[in-house]
């Protein structure tokens, strides 16, 4: 018979013959021959292959590097890679989450508009007139200036976007 020019799914062509691919979780040891089947071997500890393949080496599981703010979300198997995610207080630098960075803090004069998540950073906004923030924080919103009037006090020092107003006693009118 004519040697094949194409093979079925889960097969590959070698030496004019169709050999079975190795299943996920296994690597190729030797190609099939006219008389023998493809020889495959399971991937070792901390290795994987996630497709039908003819790879002679398994891939190492991804290392979730704590130096990059990463931790293991899901441990890898012989057929799947390890999935990493960010440590608490960190967020991914891209959709693929290959590394993480610490959430940004909002500087004094700015408040948190949106608290960071594992995939998005802190969103800051400038404190508008009547509000202030005197700390660098990843959680604190802008606070409203103290209302001196409700305490029967008067404004002694005006507030800014970084400082609260300073209240003081009303001047007593002497008889």
């Amino acid at each position: 018979p004519e040697p094949p020019t194409a093979c079925r799914e889960k097969q590959y062509l070698i030496n004019s013959q169709c050999c079975s691919l190795c299943q996920p979780g296994q690597k190729l040891v030797s190609d099939c021959t006219e008389f023998t089947e493809t020889e495959c071997l399971p991937c070792g500890e901390s290795e994987f292959l996630d497709t039908w393949n003819r790879e002679t080496h398994c891939h190492q599981h991804k290392y979730c590097d704590p130096n990059l703010g990463l931790r293991v979300q899901q441990k890898g198997t012989s057929e799947t890679d390890t999935i990493c995610t960010c440590e608490e207080g960190w967020h991914c630098t891209s959709e693929a989450c290959e590394s993480c960075v610490l959430h940004r803090s909002c500087s004094p004069g700015f408040g948190v508009k949106q608290i960071a998540t594992g995939v998005s950073d802190t969103i800051c906004e400038p404190c508008p007139v009547g509000f202030f923030s005197n700390v660098s924080s990843a959680f604190e919103k802008c606070h409203p200036w103290t209302s001196c009037e409700t305490k029967d006090l008067v404004v002694q020092q005006a507030g800014t976007n970084k400082t609260d107003v300073v209240c003081g006693p009303q001047d007593r009118l002497r008889a």
Partner: antibody, heavy 116, light 108 residues
Framework: EVTLKESGPVLVKPTETLTLTCTVS????????VSWIRQPPGKALEWLAG???????YYASWAKSRLTISRDTNLKQVVLTMTNMDPVDTATYYC??????????WGQGTLVTVSS | AFQLTQSPSSLSASVGDRVTITCQAS??????LAWYQQKPGKPPKLLIV???NLASGVPSRFSGSGSGTDFTLTISSLQPEDFATYYC??????????FGGGTKVEIK
């Protein structure tokens, strides 16, 4: 063993399109991204583009209109095309493992000269 | 556009000297900064990740510090093999993935 190897033309003419291929081994493109970084002779490194393990493509803003990055996970290749080449694009072009991240693994680089 | 400004662009030092290189980002990048060493004709070698963490196999004389916009690479006691060019790199986001202009460390 993790390896990355760049291939493509060593000489291109001005206005031509450059196509570079990065062939990887020892890791899966479904697990790691790949970026292209270049270095003109005697000058600094310049990040050009990256493709994440999820297939997302990212480009340097200054070169976005000229670049396309793509991958073939089965062939284990990442391809960068750069249109309208100019002599100032003469550089060593590196591919490195990683998308938007740090780059611990690099290819040896390929020098591309743009000249008529 | 986002920028990383590295200084100095070059410096001369002797073996045993303490060397400091700075990198300034045009906007906050939190801890998303790496440092590399490059020797002529070779690809860069990763030294520091996350602004202050030593990459695998890097000698402890190298250290990094900083967060936000200002970062520093320090070599506590310069060795003969440390004469090279050093680059900072931001990886905070896709729009801020950039290399600094480099610092060439030469023998005095």
């Amino acid at each position: 063993e993790v390896t990355l190897k760049e291939s493509g033309p060593v000489l291109v003419k001005p206005t031509e399109t450059l196509t570079l291929t990065c062939t990887v081994s020892g890791f899966s493109l479904s697990s790691y991204g790949v970026s292209w970084i270049r270095q003109p002779p005697g000058k600094a490194l310049e990040w050009l583009a990256g493709i994440g393990s999820d297939g997302s493509a990212y480009y340097a803003s200054w070169a976005k209109s000229r670049l396309t990055i793509s991958r073939d996970t089965n062939l284990k290749q990442v391809v960068l095309t750069m249109t309208n080449m100019d002599p100032v694009d003469t550089a060593t072009y590196y591919c490195a493992r990683g998308g938007i991240t740090v780059y611990a693994m690099w290819g040896q680089g390929t020098l591309v000269t743009v000249s008529s | 556009a986002f920028q990383l400004t590295q200084s100095p662009s070059s410096l001369s030092a002797s073996v045993g000297d303490r060397v400091t290189i700075t990198c300034q980002a045009s906007q906050s990048i939190s801890t998303g900064l790496a440092w590399y060493q490059q020797k002529p004709g070779k690809p860069p070698k990763l030294l520091i990740v996350g602004a202050s963490n030593l990459a695998s196999g890097v000698p402890s004389r190298f250290s990094g510090s900083g967060s936000g916009t200002d970062f520093t690479l320090t070599i506590s006691s310069l060795q003969p093999e440390d004469f090279a060019t050093y680059y900072c790199q931001s990886y905070f986001s896709s729009s801020s993935t950039v290399f600094g202009g480099g610092t060439k460390v030469e023998i005095k």
